[in-house]
């Protein structure tokens, strides 16, 4: 289905530039560039520049976060679960019964049996079966830190409900820590949220596996339904491949701009508003690194005789198992601009303007 | 560059099915389907089914969240900022000075001037310039709710730092509420996090615009740098288009499965492991709705004479301003499976297996 032709890089760039011309006008809902007849002389007002910079800061702060998914994310994760240590265990006696907290402990040897190496853990969730709740309740989750100290993890606002419902807390980082350390028993605390003014908060929510007195009675609904950790991890035997096989490359600017990759990759393209689009109406910035995606994503026939070799290519060339994989943007970033409408300078943010990485999809 | 041909739907489906065959084996790092010679007779053990169901629950709970981006997100957002009411305003006198909190109030008439309709607001951030901080501090943000009551919004763990740094809190929902209500002054409270045991927490962090005594002195660094709301909104004159023009469709199963859309859309494809792949080794599920993306994404020449008509098409057909837009998956969901390795049943989660929506990219 795929016909090979040599790519006219200049034509592709031209088409990308022309598409950007339409995209910017379309995003601003302008049929044509705005008239510049009313623009006052001199630089932009300081307040406008400050606002433009605030917007740029926001973009900078955000774009640093989403990393391209690591190679390991492509591969299957084995799912296991580790039930909470039963409440008649002596560990619970060390923690005073309290109206504002319940305690949940886990045996780390069971965790290590399920996930032998911290690096193999992909996700860990603490699952609690919440029984009916009469009033709204704000709860907080803590992790046991040292002997009797607790570290805040997250919070949740629970709406009143007549029926039981599973609650899930992402505790991946915590479980990874536990797997790295030598402790035998580790735990969580679920507490009522106490603000600095009102301190008489009681934990109203009933969690399956605890009586109202915050202890025992695992038969509340079913022993299997007591709190547990749901673990998703790369099996040990599969992890060897991850180290040994060639890693799935992030097709981002770091890799693509410094390589001669022929297949799908992000390609460098700087748009100078004045030179490339003949536009003088955008006051800031003067241009931007739009970039674009280009390169083949070969369809892989899984019935190929070289089966194991072929399968190794899926991750890079057709991870989504498409009938016709295509090289498209993965990570995109917004672009703030300053321009005048009549005498009024405007700061506007245009979404998804800068291509940071590509993928076969 | 685009040559029109009639699409052989059956060939596309066949290629998608074959790609899925390779994808699943590749994700499990198997060169061929596992031998079933050790599988014991009868159904899966109850504990394995419970684990599989837990994994399915997780998927169900998650997939409900990420909505395809609304049409408005494509268009440019005007950026404005509204500074905090200066601290010599009498509103501050109503709130007792405290060691654990600072208060920030905003004039809603200024907010309404910037964003006349709540629906136009795309994002609102509370920006605070944090001065140097000696110790780690856990802070909480509250919104003024009624006369003297405060509603918890979010929290942040602030690391020690020698240099000033901007903090940003997403308060879109709150500001949207304020725009809908009739109040004149609305506010936030930044407090130290108090747990139910230790209640002597002091707010250690210094926010520009407040003295250590938690009042006044706006010149700490710069008046413009006192707390402010950064607003991103669709301008009123542009909003009319949003209502009047045909909305950007979410190319998801709801729309695509019930329409005769010729252009890019998600197409229905159920994979029965036994019938389509000849596989009997996956115990659960028996099959799944893989779906696939298909349909043209026409390249739009923005130099076209019918300029305003052409621009309206960008949002649907080439929102990323690609030189060769392509119909690809947008929202994907994972698939948990149960299969045997020898005598051992395994529950594994395969990422990005189900196509829920498509986009031109």
């Amino acid at each position: 289905l795929s016909t090979c032709k040599t790519i006219d890089m200049e034509l592709v760039k031209r088409k990308r530039i022309e598409a950007i011309r339409g995209q910017i006008l379309s995003k601003l809902r302008l049929a044509s560039p705005p008239s510049q007849g009313e623009v006052p002389p001199g630089p932009l007002p300081e307040a406008v520049l400050a606002l433009y910079n605030s917007t740029r800061d926001r973009v900078a702060g955000e774009s640093a976060e989403p990393e391209p998914e690591p190679e390991a994310d492509y591969y299957a994760k084995e799912v296991t679960r580790v039930l909470m240590v039963e409440t008649h265990n002596e560990i619970y006696d060390k923690f005073k019964q309290s109206t504002h907290s319940i305690y949940m402990f886990f045996n780390t040897s069971e965790l290590r049996e399920a996930v032998p190496e911290p690096v193999l853990l992909s996700r860990a969730e603490l699952r609690l079966l919440r029984l009916k709740l009469k009033v709204e309740q704000h709860v907080e989750l803590y992790q046991k830190y040292s002997n009797n100290s607790w570290r805040y993890l997250s919070n949740r606002l629970l709406a009143p409900s007549d029926s039981p419902e599973w609650l899930s807390f992402d505790v991946t980082g915590v479980v990874r820590q536990w797997l790295s350390r030598g402790g035998e028993i580790e735990g969580f605390r679920l507490s009522a949220h106490c603000s600095c003014d009102s301190r008489d908060n009681t934990l109203q929510v009933d969690i399956n596996g605890f009586t109202t007195g915050r202890r025992g009675d695992l038969a509340t609904i079913h022993g299997m339904n007591r709190p547990f950790l749901l673990l998703m991890a790369t099996p040990l035997e599969r992890a060897q491949h991850l180290q040994s096989s060639r890693h799935r490359r992030a097709l981002d600017t770091n890799y693509c701009f410094s390589s001669t990759e022929k297949n799908c990759c992000v390609r460098q393209l700087y748009i100078d508003f004045r030179k490339d689009l003949g536009w003088k109406w955008i006051h800031e910035p003067k241009g931007y690194h739009a970039n674009f995606c280009l390169g083949p994503c070969p369809y892989i026939w899984s019935l190929d005789t070289q089966y194991s070799k072929v399968l190794a290519l899926y991750n890079q060339h057709n991870p989504g198992a498409s009938a016709a994989p295509c090289c498209v943007p993965q990570a995109l970033e917004p672009l703030p601009i300053v321009y005048y409408v009549g005498r009024k300078p405007k700061v506007e943010q245009l979404s998804n303007m800068i291509v940071r990485s590509c993928k076969c999809s | 560059l685009s040559t029109c041909k009639t699409i052989d739907m059956e060939l596309v489906k066949r290629k998608r099915i074959e790609a899925i065959r390779g994808q699943i084996l590749s994700k499990l790092r198997l060169a061929s389907p596992p031998s079933q010679g050790e599988v014991p007779p009868g159904p899966l053990p109850e504990a394995v089914l419970a684990l599989y169901n837990s994994t399915r629950d997780r998927v169900a709970g998650e997939s409900a969240e990420p909505e395809p981006e609304p049409e408005a997100d494509y268009y440019a957002k005007e950026v404005t900022r509204v500074l905090m009411v200066e601290t010599h305003n009498e509103i501050y006198d109503k709130f007792k000075q405290s060691t654990h909190s600072i208060y920030m109030f905003f004039n809603t008439s200024e907010l309404r001037e910037a964003v006349p309709e709540p629906v136009l607001l795309s994002r609102a951030e509370l920006r605070l310039l944090r001065l140097k901080l000696k110790v780690e501090q856990h802070v909480e943000l509250y919104q003024k709710y009624s006369n003297n009551s405060w509603r918890y919004l979010s929290n942040r763990l602030l690391a020690p730092s020698d240099s000033p740094e901007w903090l940003s809190f997403d308060v879109t929902g709150v500001v949207r509420q304020w725009l809908s209500r009739g109040g004149e002054i609305e506010g936030f409270r930044l407090s130290a996090h108090c747990s139910c045991d230790s209640r002597d927490n002091t707010l250690q962090v210094d926010i520009n615009g407040f003295t250590t005594g938690r009042r006044g002195d706006l010149a700490t660094i710069h008046g413009m740098n006192r707390p402010f709301l950064l607003l991103m909104a669709t301008p009123l004159e542009r909003a009319q288009h949003l209502q009047s023009s045909r909305h950007r469709r979410a190319l998801d199963t709801n729309y695509c499965f019930s329409s005769t859309e010729k252009n890019c859309c998600v197409r229905q494809l159920y994979i029965d492991f036994r019938k389509d792949l000849g596989w009997k080794w996956i115990h659960e599920p028996k099959g799944y709705h893989a779906n696939f993306c298909l349909g043209p994404c026409p390249y739009i020449w923005s130099l076209d004479t019918q300029y305003s008509k052409v621009l309206a098409l960008y949002n649907q057909h080439n929102p990323g301003a690609s030189a060769a837009p392509c119909c690809v998956p947008q929202a994907l969901e994972p698939l948990p499976i149960v299969y045997y390795v020898g005598r051992k049943p395994k529950v594994e989660q395969l990422s990005n297996m189900i196509v829920r929506s498509c986009k031109c990219s």
């Epitope: - | 079933q36 010679g37 050790e38 599988v39 007779p41 009868g42």
Partner: antibody, heavy 121, light 107 residues
Framework: EVQLLESGGGLVQPGGSLRLSCAAS????????MSWVRQAPGKGLEWVSA????????YYADSVKGRFTISRDNSKNTLYLQMNSLRAEDTAVYYC??????????????WGRGTLVTVSS | DIQMTQSPSSLSASVGDRVTITCRAS??????LNWYQQKPGKAPKLLIY???SLQSGVPSRFSGSGSGTDFTLTISSLQPEDFATYYC?????????FGGGTKLEIK
């Protein structure tokens, strides 16, 4: 050609022993669980025993437990049934059957022609 | 042990008839049920597995249905070569057990 061929049947006295063999060909023998099913003259089918692909797991009907032993030699593509303490009610045609155990459904998708075992004094 | 009861034990029908044989399990076996055909002097042959899946090479006039305790084998239009004895078999748990059989004869 994919096939199963039983041998070793015959006449034996009550309390005696017999060893049945089943030679497999045309498929990857070690990838399949295997089974023995018997049919008394003019009666219905009765499952006797089964063994996993590696030989690591064995299963027996209550009526033969402790008297019959199932085994396999994957290097020779052969399945065995060692029958001790034979009784008159063990008289039957013994079929060797390949088990497709996919999904735990355990169905017999390939059968041999059978070998007759007669227990009589 | 799980008992399998087939009915009827024998049945007379003509070529072209639609025939239904039922099989009942003494407890729920989900869809862990298989059907076989046996002709005199021959080994049994697999027709249906997992209650409703047609084994490859078996004519489409054969179909299976049911779940839990009640199952049926249906032959939509009897052909001369279909006169034989039919057995159901459960694989929900060991010991694996067969039904007593249904003998289908020419009327």
């Amino acid at each position: 050609e994919v096939q199963l061929l039983e041998s070793g049947g015959g006449l034996v006295q009550p309390g005696g022993s017999l060893r049945l063999s089943c030679a497999a060909s045309g498929f990857t023998f070690s990838s399949y669980a295997m089974s023995w099913v018997r049919q008394a003259p003019g009666k219905g089918l009765e499952w006797v025993s089964a063994i996993s692909g590696s030989g690591g797991s064995t299963y027996y009907a209550d009526s033969v437990k402790g008297r019959f032993t199932i085994s396999r030699d994957n290097s020779k593509n052969t399945l065995y049934l060692q029958m001790n303490s034979l009784r008159a009610e063990d008289t039957a045609v013994y079929y060797c059957a390949r088990v497709d155990s996919s999904g735990g459904y355990w169905y017999f998708d390939l059968w041999g022609r059978g070998t007759l075992v007669t227990v009589s004094s | 042990d799980i008992q399998m009861t087939q009915s009827p034990s024998s049945l007379s029908a003509s070529v072209g008839d639609r025939v239904t044989i039922t099989c009942r399990a003494s407890q729920s076996i989900s869809s862990y049920l298989n059907w076989y055909q046996q002709k005199p002097g021959k080994a049994p042959k697999l027709l249906i597995y997992a209650a409703s899946s047609l084994q490859s090479g078996v004519p489409s006039r054969f179909s299976g249905s049911g779940s839990g305790t009640d199952f049926t084998l249906t032959i939509s239009s009897l052909q001369p070569e279909d006169f034989a004895t039919y057995y159901c078999q459960q694989s929900y748990s060991t010991p694996l057990t067969f039904g007593g059989g249904t003998k289908l004869e020419i009327k």
